[in-house]
């Protein structure tokens, strides 16, 4: 950290690497919950026009797709992978792509993904063929 930038006590807004350089935060699609037409597709675009700077450097991009008897919604946010989201751990937070995985939720179909490259939650992937290690 440059000497003129204060490092305050218990500050999770400043994250540094081994060389002391400050890591910048993720850029994620951030439209909270919106109605979606994404259904029965291998992948979908979020159709979220807002790309936000995540508040904390450790946060990653998250997308949550939910379908019930009435509608389909897609949620796009930033979230700290150390904390559960919708009661689930973000297992794939280091992935560069947002690969949707189904979670058990009563009364609805619920998929969630997380990822850590800029705007990676803009393209959500359901297709099983992406679930293996893929460098791209």
């Amino acid at each position: 950290i440059p000497p003129h930038v204060q490092k305050s006590v218990n500050n999770d807004m400043i994250v540094t690497d081994n060389n002391g350089a400050v890591k910048f935060p993720q850029l994620c699609k951030f439209c909270d919950v919106r109605f979606s037409t994404c259904d029965n597709q291998k992948s979908c675009m979020s159709n979220c026009s807002i790309t936000s700077i995540c508040e904390k450097p450790q946060e990653v991009c998250v997308a949550v797709w939910r379908k019930n008897d009435e509608n389909i919604t897609l949620e796009t946010v930033c979230h700290d992978p150390k904390l559960p989201y919708h009661d689930f751990i973000l297992e794939d937070a280091a992935s560069p792509k947002c690969i949707m995985k189904e979670k058990k939720k009563p009364g609805e179909t619920f998929f969630m993904c997380s990822c850590s490259s800029d705007e990676c939650n803009d393209n959500i992937i359901f297709s099983e063929e992406y679930n293996t290690s893929n460098p791209d």
Partner: nanobody, 124 residues
Framework: EVQLLESGGGLVQPGGSLRLSCAAS???????RMWWVRQAPGKGLEWVS?????????YYANSVRGRFTISRDNSKNTLYLQMNSLRAEDTAVYYC?????????????????WGQGTLVTVSS
């Protein structure tokens, strides 16, 4: 030698406006994503806004969206931050920073150079 020199800070009343500038030298300005970062007294860093090197695509923190506008003039190697509808909570030292290019701008990229900062005080 890389240099980033911020200016334009000062005392302004709530609801007022300021325009910050950051003059860059010593590196190829058009190769870097540039950021405005702020630090309020006794608080941590807050990443305010960023702009891509080419195409001028911009990003904002939710706390300033709709009030602040980032821009850059690549011919003058200068970064700007137009701040409108200022609030007391915008009081901070504002820094510009250049971002080391990472693979596809992934989270492995990091800030390498900072300016000395310019103080913005919003108070009546």
């Amino acid at each position: 030698e890389v240099q980033l020199l911020e200016s334009g800070g000062g005392l302004v009343q709530p609801g007022g406006s300021l325009r910050l500038s950051c003059a860059a030298s010593g590196f190829t300005f058009t190769e870097y994503r540039m950021w405005w970062v702020r630090q309020a007294p006794g608080k941590g860093l807050e990443w305010v806004s960023a702009i891509e090197p080419i195409g001028n695509r911009t990003y904002y923190a939710n706390s300033v969206r709709g009030r602040f506008t980032i821009s850059r003039d690549n011919s003058k190697n200068t970064l700007y931050l137009q701040m409108n509808s200022l609030r007391a909570e915008d009081t901070a030292v504002y820094y510009c920073a250049k971002q080391i290019p990472g693979r596809k701008w992934t989270a492995n990229s990091r800030f390498d150079y900072w300016g000395q900062g310019t103080l913005v005080t919003v108070s009546s």
